[in-house]
C-alpha cells in the first residue's frame, strides 16, 4: 500500500486516519527534504492531484481540507515542488478510511442444524460500516457460569462438542471497530430447543389420471427427530401469492402429498420443517417445478420435456394415465 513508501517528511490526518463518513477532515503534509525549501506542496488522492482547499501553514507544511468526506477508502500522498528540481519530490503517503461505528447487533439467533455438529449463531449487524468490524460472540453457561468468546467477522459456527456446560446458555454479540463498540441483548437458549431437522427435499411429482386429476408430491428428510411439523407452499409460477399446506410428519417413509391443480400450468413447490413446538424453521427447500398436463393422456406414449426455466431442469415422462416430474435443479 501507499504506507510502505520511503518518506521525506510525514503526512497525518485530523481527526484520525479512520474517521466517521461525512466528516470534515484535514490532511497535513510536512516536508523534510534536504536542500529544499518547498515552493509548493501538492496533495494527491488515488493518484489525482488535488486542486482546491489547500492552505500553506508554514514553510514546510500544508493542509488539505475536505468537507463531508464520503469515500470509504482513499490513498493520499503529498509532494513538494523544490527550486531547481524538475520533478516533484515525494514526501509521504497514507491510506485513509471512513465509515460508521457498528449498530447494536440485534436478532441474535443460534440454531443447530441436525448432523452438523455445530451451533450456528447469526445476527443482524445493522447498517454497513465500510471499515473493518469485528464481532465477539459470548457464550455463557447458565449452569457452570463459564464463558467462552469467539471472534469473527460475520456469523460463527461453534462445535457442539465445545459446549460442555450443560444445555442452557446465554449468548450475546459485541461489535467493535475503530469508531465504536456496541453489544446486543442477551439471548437465552436451550440446546434441545434450537435443533433444526435435516433438510426436507422434494424428490418428484406425478399427476394421476382420475375423474379430477390430482398431483402427488413426493418428499423426504433424513431426520431422526420423531415429531416434525412441516409446511409445503406452492403457487403457479405466474402468481405472486403462495398457498400453504401444513403437515405433522413422521419421516420413517417418503411423504406423499396430494394437490388438486389446474391443468397446463407450471407450478413451483417448496417445503420446510421444524421440530414440533420449537422455534426455528428450516429455510425453504430449493424450488421444485412441475407442469400439470394439458389434458390427461388416454394412450400410452413416451416424451421428454426439458425445461431450464429459473435454473430448474424438469424432465417429464408421460405414460398411460399419469405424468411424472423429477426436478433436481436448483
Amino acid at each position: 500500500g501507499i504506507t510502505n513508501i520511503n518518506c521525506s517528511g510525514h503526512i497525518w490526518v485530523e481527526p484520525a486516519t479512520i474517521f466517521k463518513m461525512g466528516m470534515n477532515i484535514s490532511i497535513y503534509c510536512q516536508a523534510a527534504i534536504k536542500n529544499c525549501q518547498p515552493r509548493k506542496l501538492h496533495f494527491y488522492k488515488n493518484g489525482i492531484k488535488e486542486r482546491f482547499q489547500i492552505t500553506r501553514i508554514n514553510k514546510t507544511t500544508a493542509r488539505l481540507w475536505y468537507k463531508n468526506f464520503l469515500e470509504p477508502h482513499a490513498s493520499m500522498y503529498c509532494t513538494a515542488e523544490c527550486p531547481k528540481h524538475f520533478q516533484e519530490t515525494l514526501i509521504c503517503g497514507k491510506d485513509i478510511s471512513s465509515g460508521y461505528p457498528p449498530d447494536i447487533p440485534d436478532e441474535v439467533t443460534c440454531v443447530i442444524y441436525e448432523y452438523s455438529g455445530n451451533m450456528t449463531c447469526t445476527w443482524n449487524a445493522g447498517k454497513l460500516t465500510y471499515i473493518d468490524t469485528k464481532y465477539v460472540v459470548h457464550v455463557k453457561s447458565l449452569e457452570t457460569e463459564e464463558e467462552q468468546q469467539y471472534l469473527t467477522s460475520s456469523y460463527i459456527n461453534i462445535s457442539t462438542d465445545s459446549l460442555q456446560g450443560g444445555k442452557k446458555y446465554l449468548v450475546w454479540v459485541q461489535a467493535a471497530n475503530a469508531l465504536g463498540m456496541e453489544e446486543s441483548k442477551q439471548l437465552q437458549i436451550h440446546l434441545d430447543d434450537i435443533v433444526i431437522p435435516s433438510a426436507a427435499v422434494i424428490s418428484r411429482a406425478e399427476t394421476i389420471n382420475a375423474t379430477v386429476p390430482k398431483t402427488i408430491i413426493y418428499w423426504d428428510s433424513q431426520t431422526t427427530i420423531e415429531k416434525v411439523s412441516c409446511e409445503m407452499r406452492y403457487k403457479a409460477t405466474t402468481n405472486q401469492t403462495w398457498n400453504v399446506k401444513e403437515f405433522d410428519t413422521n419421516f420413517t417413509y417418503v411423504q406423499q402429498s396430494e394437490f388438486y391443480l389446474e391443468p397446463n400450468i407450471k407450478y413451483v413447490f417448496q417445503v420446510r420443517c421444524q421440530e414440533t413446538g420449537k422455534r426455528y424453521w428450516q429455510p425453504w427447500s430449493s424450488p421444485f417445478f412441475h407442469k400439470t398436463p394439458e389434458t390427461v393422456p388416454q394412450v400410452t406414449s413416451k416424451a421428454f420435456q426439458h425445461d431450464t426455466w429459473n435454473s430448474g431442469l424438469t424432465v417429464a415422462s408421460i405414460s398411460t394415465g399419469h405424468l411424472t416430474s423429477d426436478n433436481r435443479g436448483d
Epitope: Q37, R39, K40, I48, K49, E50, R51, F52, R56, P83
Partner: antibody, heavy 119, light 107 residues
Framework: QVQLVESGGGVVQPGRSLRLSCAAS????????MSWVRQAPGKGLDLVAD??????????YYADSVKDRFTISRDNSKNTLYLQMNSLRAEDTAVYYC??????????WGQGTLVTVSS | DIQMTQSPSSLSASVGDRVTITCRAS??????LAWYQQKPGKAPKLLIY???SLQDGVPSRFSGSGSGTDYTLTISSLQPEDFATYYC?????????FGQGTKVEIK
C-alpha cells in the same frame, strides 16, 4: 511555438448567451491547465474560469461572479477550450483572454476577444 | 483568497531610469509570484516567474526579487518599449490572484 487563438466574441444583449472558443497549438494540450481571464475596459485582470490538466482530472473553477452562469470545457481531441456564457450582464463586458498554465501562473496568452453586453 | 496589493498604481519615468514596482501579498506566498507586462490592446506577457526567474526571451534589464509577502520588479534601465502596465500574480494558493496593476508612463 505556442499559439492561442480566441473567437466567438461580439455584441450581445443582456440575458443572452455567447460561446467563446480558444484553438491551441504548439504544446501538449492535455498536460496543461487552461483558463479564461477577462479585462473590463480600463480595469485589471481577473480569472473567470479555469479547467485543470489531466493530472488534476480536469477540475474546474469559477469566479463567484460567474458561477452558475458560465461553463468552461475543453475538447482534448480538438485542442480547443470553450467558455459558454449564459445570462450575460453589462458587467461581463470585457476582453476575454485564453491563457495556458502548467503551474498556476499563466505562461502564454491569446490575443483576446471582446465581449460587449449592451441593449 | 490571497489579496495582492501593488504599488504604486502608476508612475512617471524617463528612458534610462531605474524603475521599481512592489507587490505585497496578504500572506506568505513562498516566492510563488509572477510578473506580467501588458501594452494597450495587447495580451499580457510573462516576464518573471517564481519571483526571480526570467522567462525565455525577456531582456535581462528586468529582474524580480522578494520572499515572504513582499516582492519587487525592477527595470534597471527603462527603454521606450517598456512603457506599459505591469501586473503581479500570486500562484501560491488556488485561485491565483492578480495585483491591480502599475502603469508606467513617460515623464
Amino acid at each position: 511555438q505556442v499559439q492561442l487563438v480566441e473567437s466567438g466574441g461580439g455584441v450581445v444583449q443582456p440575458g443572452r448567451s455567447l460561446r467563446l472558443s480558444c484553438a491551441a497549438s504548439g504544446f501538449d494540450f492535455n498536460s496543461y491547465g487552461m483558463s479564461w481571464v477577462r479585462q473590463a475596459p480600463g480595469k485589471g485582470l481577473d480569472l473567470v474560469a479555469d479547467i485543470s490538466s489531466k493530472s488534476y482530472n480536469y477540475a474546474t473553477y469559477y469566479a463567484d461572479s460567474v458561477k452558475d452562469r458560465f461553463t468552461i470545457s475543453r475538447d482534448n481531441s480538438k485542442n480547443t477550450l470553450y467558455l459558454q456564457m449564459n445570462s450575460l450582464r453589462a458587467e461581463d463586458t470585457a476582453v476575454y483572454y485564453c491563457a495556458v498554465h502548467h503551474s498556476d501562473y499563466f505562461e502564454y496568452w491569446g490575443q483576446g476577444t471582446l465581449v460587449t453586453v449592451s441593449s | 483568497d490571497i489579496q495582492m496589493t501593488q504599488s504604486p498604481s502608476s508612475l512617471s519615468a524617463s528612458v534610462g531610469d531605474r524603475v521599481t514596482i512592489t507587490c505585497r501579498a496578504s500572506q506568505d506566498i513562498y516566492t510563488n509570484l509572477a510578473w506580467y507586462q501588458q501594452k494597450p490592446g495587447k495580451a499580457p506577457k510573462l516576464l518573471i516567474y517564481h519571483a526571480s526567474s526570467l522567462q525565455d526571451g525577456v531582456p535581462s534589464r528586468f529582474s524580480g526579487s522578494g520572499s515572504g509577502t513582499d516582492y519587487t520588479l525592477t527595470i534597471s534601465s527603462l527603454q521606450p518599449e517598456d512603457f506599459a502596465t505591469y501586473y503581479c500574480l500570486q500562484d501560491s494558493e488556488y485561485p491565483p490572484t492578480f495585483g491591480q496593476g502599475t502603469k508606467v508612463e513617460i515623464k
